[in-house]
């Protein structure tokens, strides 16, 4: 079975440092895959970030960027500028 | 700014090993992965491997499995290499470098001098 | 492992001209999802570690001029620096990350002629 594992639980964040979330596949290459990364909210709202061929939701592009580590089978979120509004659960997930 | 400050150059003879120290300051030491590579006199550049600092997880190059080993003191944001059964041919300079971004190393330590010589 | 091989291994340039310098890969660096080639530069001067000029083929990093760009794609890469300054005499090296083990190319030296 395939697993993404997320590589820190926590995060802390320097607003304005940019910061790297990162998911590692586990059983299967992740070129088999597209990435997909989301966040969670006070109340339990799950937002889309990114999907893979760069494809962002509304108000995520300027701020984050998704890409993928071929060699070492990562899923990786980059945000760019953090601010307070960015704080949240950030969950990758990955479809075919 | 970001900074990684390596130790001082070594002079080893063959079949010892050496330790080399690279202290990081200026960002998240445990956010990002650092690699060693390695120049040999008047050459290119060779990969050596790399640590996870966060979790310690490491993945090295073929050619150094089992002489290599990189290890991490979180506490002081300091990542170690070091390289057993030293020969001739591991003279070189040894750099630490970080990856911000994904694979390509944004910043380089001074570069450590290490020689073998009998 | 991907073999990186750089042409010319020398070259001498007058200044405001153009260098350019070509790296091929043994195999395609390019991941189809992402469109994405996993190719750095680097410049190393004498006695300096290198420093990160390109990354994804094409992406120059913060700070470094204009002058120098990358192209290519799959396996076929170029760097152009597009007028020669005497600031720019160095080695130049090519790098791959699309797999373990990273490997660089053998190295350009570029002089003033």
């Known amino acids: 079975a395939i697993e993404l594992v997320p590589e820190h639980q926590t995060v802390p964040v320097s607003i304005g440092v940019p910061a790297t979330l990162r998911c590692s596949m586990k059983g299967e290459a992740i070129g088999n895959y597209y990435i997909n990364w989301y966040r969670k909210t006070q109340g339990n709202t799950m937002t889309f970030i990114y999907r893979e061929k760069d494809i962002y939701g509304p108000g995520f592009k300027d701020n984050f960027q998704g890409d993928i580590d071929i060699a070492k089978n990562l899923a990786v979120l980059k945000i760019l500028a953090p601010s307070e509004r960015d704080e949240g659960s950030y969950y990758c997930a990955c479809d075919t | 700014e970001v900074q990684l400050v390596q130790s001082g150059a070594e002079v080893k003879k063959p079949g010892a090993s050496v330790k080399v120290s690279c202290k990081a300051s200026g960002y998240t030491f445990t956010g990002y992965y650092l690699h060693w590579v390695r120049q040999a006199p008047g050459q290119g550049l060779e990969w050596v491997g790399w640590i996870n600092p966060s979790s310690g997880d490491t993945d090295y190059a073929q050619t150094f499995q089992g002489r290599v080993t990189m290890t991490r003191d979180t506490s002081i944001s300091t990542a170690y290499m070091e390289l057993s059964r030293l020969r001739s041919d591991d003279t070189a300079v040894y750099y630490c470098a970080n990856e911000l971004g994904i694979g390509v190393f944004d910043y380089w330590g001074q570069g450590t001098l290490v020689t073998v010589s009998s | 492992d991907i073999v990186m091989t750089q042409s010319p291994d020398s070259l001498a340039v007058s200044l405001g001209e153009r260098a350019t310098i070509n790296c091929k890969s043994s195999q395609s660096v390019l991941y189809s999802s992402n469109n994405k080639n996993y190719l750095g530069w680097y410049q190393q001067k004498p006695g300096q570690p290198p420093k990160l000029l390109i990354y994804?083929?094409?992406t120059r990093e913060s700070g470094v001029p204009d002058r120098f760009s990358g192209s290519g794609s799959g396996t076929d890469f170029t760097l152009t620096i597009s007028s020669l300054q005497a600031e720019d005499v160095a080695v130049y090296f090519c790098?791959?990350?699309?797999?373990?083990?990273?490997?660089f190319g053998q190295g350009t030296k570029v002089d003033i002629k």
């Open positions: 790098q791959q990350y699309y797999s373990i083990p990273y490997t």
């Open positions: 994804w083929a094409s």
